[in-house]
Amino acid sequence: EQAPGNAPCSSGSSWSADLDKCMDCASCPARPHSDFCLGCAAAPPAHFRMLWP
């Protein structure tokens, strides 16, 4: 998954079309419905942090 302009997301993150930015794949075990989770690795890290501010 890549950001517009061919700027790739860093390792462990994936592009969210719903937010127009890279998002941390670590949140996907908690909320797999997020659009960016489709672009995350099949086996995300066991420890993840929430994305709340």
Partner: antibody
């Protein structure tokens, strides 16, 4: 101060159309996802539609899919909802709301609402 | 869609009372649960996000707890301005965001 001001509501016949606007001020509009939420008279809240900061991604509740279109003009700090093929059950107060900057998390600021009445 | 069920649908309480409102999800939603307050003729106001985080500017008498399927909004000491309708909202099953049916807090 963050402000969201809806306009465009009114009385329309079944099958008719309306375009709602939501003018944003007091914050930088372009980085935020935006939503429309509605509330039928005396009823609870129903999420209607979502649009990404760039406007490239949109989502709709099943009840309005194919009839409503959400859009935004970041140069004008304005959110829109084009409502076509209106039905009596679309009668409600329509609120625009600012989404959180993570992912569909919450609605931290709301407009005062605009009433849409669909009746013959 | 995930269904959100609030209880009670209404309650009567006095100023100074401790008030508890519950919200149950039809399936686990982790901590993706928010609470709003709505007064008649006004827009909803965000009180609590992520189940237990207090929104900026909201009085500390409001608190939230829970995870999974069961959540609680507590008002530790009800004030006159707290008489309103309260809604829970899940943001787990995106984009199918859903709200509870509301709990109306009335003056006893």
């Amino acid at each position: 101060e963050v402000q969201l001001l809806e306009s465009g509501g009114g009385l329309v016949q079944p099958g008719g159309s309306l375009r709602l606007s939501c003018a944003a001020s007091g914050f930088t509009f372009s980085p935020y996802p935006m939503m429309w939420v509605r509330q039928a008279p005396g009823k609870g809240l129903e999420w209607v539609s979502y649009i990404s900061p760039s406007g490239g991604s949109t989502h709709y509740a099943d009840s309005v899919k194919g009839r409503f279109t959400i859009s935004r003009d970041n140069s004008k700090n304005t959110l829109y909802l084009q409502m076509n093929s209106l039905r009596a059950e679309d009668t409600a107060v329509y609120y625009c709301a600012r989404g959180g900057d993570t992912y569909f998390d919450y609605f931290d600021y709301w407009g005062q609402g605009t009433l849409v009445t669909v009746s013959s | 869609d995930i269904q959100m069920t609030q209880s009670p649908s209404s309650l009567s309480a006095s100023v100074g009372d401790r008030v508890t409102i519950t919200c149950r999800a039809s399936q686990s939603i982790s901590s993706y649960l928010n609470w709003y307050q709505q007064k008649p003729g006004k827009a909803p106001k965000l009180l609590i996000y992520a189940a237990s985080s207090l929104q900026s500017g909201v009085p500390s008498r409001f608190s939230g707890s829970g995870s999974g399927t069961d959540f609680t909004l507590t008002i530790s000491s009800l004030q006159p301005e707290d008489f309103a309708t309260y809604y829970c909202q899940q943001s787990y099953s995106t984009p199918g965001i859903t709200f509870g049916q509301g709990t109306k807090v009335e003056i006893k």
